[in-house]
Interface confidence: medium
């Protein structure tokens, strides 16, 4: 439910964003998301999924790539790049679901 | 910067219909649930309803219930609240509210500036 | 009945340390996390605490948030005559199906 507190099994992912409560989190999915704001540095944020899966399918673009995986811990190592810089060959954004 | 506009309120008589619009910009609409939060004159906050990111899901407060429908259309960034068979007691301040992130359960986190509904013959 | 129960008022002297209540039930509190509002006079809320114990960017690590079992509480410390306000738990409530808020606590300086 969209709306609703997630319920349902969850799992660890590492957590670093600036809304972080501790070193990892516990969701549906694990996320990387590397966003570049107007006039500023890309920033990768690493946190937890509970809604809106259809982002983990969106390919990268040069302001945002948003990466989804499903196991334990698996978005620790995961680096993203944007669409300017990437050729489409690599674009590790894929999702399985 | 996030953006919440309403419009629409106004003074009604009992048992008639209203409808109050919110204008969202600054942000993704399509992405956020949606709220509506209402205050009466001197009173505290009373949650009204919310509305999923597509719509597909919504929930009421129990005294609203059956009369009021929440809506929105993510082509036009703008949430509804149609408010039919309107009471005394429904006179308020009307906040359309964002949630903070994707998350659900996610806390309501931006606010509009309000519009004011007096219910009065 | 309220769902989410405050006290009415509450009030401090500046530099003191004030804290809010909040009780409510498992299917509130119990389940879900809490967040805390504050509301100056003639304008919109705004969000305080959200999941049980998080500070948004921008708000003062003066104030902070726990819980246990089926209550909260917000504090506030080193209070401030800025801080006069109306302050507002909130939870989602699965019995309910319904997001719902405290019965609202004034805070005022003495």
């Known amino acids: 439910d969209p709306v609703k507190p997630s319920r349902g099994p969850l799992v660890t992912c590492t957590c670093e964003s600036p809304h972080c409560k501790g070193p990892t989190c516990r969701g549906a999915w694990c996320t990387v998301v590397l966003v570049r704001e107007e006039g500023r540095h890309p920033q990768e944020h690493r946190g937890c999924g509970n809604l809106h899966r259809e982002l983990c399918r969106g390919r990268p673009t040069e302001f945002v790539n948003h990466y989804c995986c499903d196991s334990h811990l698996c978005n620790h190592n995961v680096s993203l790049v944007l669409e300017a810089t990437q050729p489409p060959s690599e674009q590790p954004g894929t999702d399985g679901q | 910067e996030v953006q919440l506009v309403g419009s629409g309120g106004g003074v009604v008589q009992p048992g008639r219909s209203l409808r109050l619009s919110c204008a969202a910009s600054?942000?993704?609409?399509?992405?956020?649930?949606m709220h509506w939060v209402r205050q009466a004159p001197g009173k505290g906050l009373e949650w009204v309803a919310v509305?999923?990111?597509?719509?597909?899901?919504?929930y009421y407060a129990d005294s609203v219930k059956g009369r009021f429908t929440i809506s929105r259309d993510n082509s036009k960034n703008t949430l509804y609240l149609q408010m039919n068979s309107l009471r005394a007691e429904d006179t308020a301040v009307y906040y359309c509210?964002?949630?903070?992130?994707?998350?659900?359960?996610?806390?309501?986190?931006?606010w509009g500036q309000g519009t004011l509904v007096t219910v009065s013959s | 009945l309220p769902v989410l129960t405050q006290p009415p008022s509450a009030s401090g002297t500046p530099g003191q340390r004030v804290t809010i209540s909040c009780s409510g039930s498992?299917?509130?509190?119990?389940?879900?996390?809490v967040n805390w509002y504050h509301q100056l006079p003639g304008s919109a809320p705004k969000l305080l605490i959200y999941?049980?114990?998080l500070r948004p960017s921008g708000v003062p690590d003066r104030f902070s948030g726990s819980k246990s079992g089926t209550s909260a509480s917000l504090a506030i410390s080193r209070f401030q005559s800025g801080d006069e306000a109306d302050y507002y738990c909130?939870?989602?409530?699965?019995?309910?199906?319904?997001?719902?808020f405290g019965t609202g606590t004034k805070l005022t300086v003495l």
């Open positions: 999941g049980d114990d």
């Open positions: 509210a964002r949630v903070r992130y994707y998350g659900s359960g996610s806390p309501i986190g931006y």
């Open positions: 909130a939870a989602w409530d699965d019995s309910l199906n319904a997001y719902v």
């Open positions: 600054g942000f993704t609409f399509s992405n956020y649930a």
């Open positions: 498992s299917s509130n509190i119990g389940g879900n996390t």
């Open positions: 509305i999923s990111y597509d719509g597909s899901n919504k």
